[in-house]
């Protein structure tokens, strides 16, 4: 999960394997200040896991987030 | 080093249920997500479900649906998968493997469980 | 469902490269993860995200991914080498491992 300083949610690592694309419902970027570039994925349970944005999976459920 | 060690073999009549066991040891079950694998003799693997831990779900492969559980026991970092209405095609070997955080794709396995159904 | 497409099998003389490819529609989009299966035993992770490999997995082993397929390449091939070979994906148009049909790769 990312963590939030000064209300800024930075995450510190990655989850390595994709997620179920039917689990997720949202992701938003974490800010430039965070030092490690992030995609965070929130789930249909209202959890939030941190993604590299440069993994092949989490651009594709980007793509497939943004068309639907 | 994770080792996962599964119970033994079974041999089933049509119609029954089978439960195959996979206990983790070196890490805590919580530490990963653990997938079934099935391989008939002589045929390839096949994918069967799994669990995600990011989400507290329980993903299965459709063909399975409705016919497989998979369950956990943290307390004894054991998982469990349950295959019911048993017929002679799911006569196979049956594999646990984890899915760790990292690196991606499912390493290591257990040493498979070999069912059998027949009447 | 996604469907991966393997070779049954693969001859090659030790000491030379052993390639074998899986095959999918726009597999180059997908990372692709490969295991070996020796006779009798469980399979074991040999390349992931198309070109990655686990500690202990020798350099000899190494993987590519273009277009609509992904190769993994057995380099100064041993007789330990031969076994049945797996290429796997997410599908996430289903939520599914798929894993291709299996390679048998024999050394002569």
């Known amino acids: 999960s990312p963590y939030s300083s000064d209300t800024t949610p930075c995450c510190f690592a990655y989850i390595a394997r994709p997620l179920p694309r039917a689990h997720i419902k949202e992701y938003f970027y974490t800010s430039g200040k965070c030092s490690n570039p992030a995609v965070v994925f929130v789930t249909r349970k209202n959890r939030q896991v941190c993604a590299n944005p440069e993994k092949k999976w989490v651009r594709e459920y980007i793509n497939s987030l943004e068309m639907s | 080093q994770v080792q996962l060690v599964q119970s033994g073999a079974e041999v089933k009549k049509p119609g029954a249920s089978v439960k195959v066991s996979c206990k983790v040891s070196g890490y805590t079950l919580n530490d990963f997500a653990m997938h079934w694998v099935r391989q008939a003799p002589g045929k390839g693997l096949e994918w069967m479900g799994g669990y995600v831990p990011e989400d507290g779900d329980t993903i299965y492969a459709q063909k399975f649906q409705g016919r497989v559980t998979m369950t956990e026991d943290t307390s004894t970092d054991t998982a469990y998968m349950e295959l019911s209405s048993l017929r002679s095609e799911d006569t196979a070997v049956y594999y646990c493997a984890t899915d760790p955080l990292y690196p991606p794709g499912l390493s290591p396995w257990g040493q498979g469980t070999t069912v059998t159904v027949s009447s | 469902s996604y469907v991966l497409t393997q070779p049954p099998s693969v001859s090659v003389a030790p000491g030379q490269t052993a390639r074998i490819t899986c095959g999918g529609n726009n597999i180059e989009s997908k990372s692709v993860h490969w295991y070996q299966q020796k006779p009798g035993q469980a399979p074991v992770l040999v390349v992931y995200d198309d070109s990655d490999r686990p500690s202990g997995i020798p350099e000899r082993f190494s993987g590519s991914n273009s277009g609509n397929t992904a190769t993994l390449t057995i380099s100064r091939v041993e007789a330990g080498d031969e076994a049945d070979y797996y290429c796997?994906?997410?599908?996430?148009?289903?939520?599914?491992?798929?894993f291709g049909g299996g390679t048998k790769v024999t050394v002569l």
């Open positions: 796997q994906v997410w599908d996430s148009n289903t939520d599914h491992w798929v």
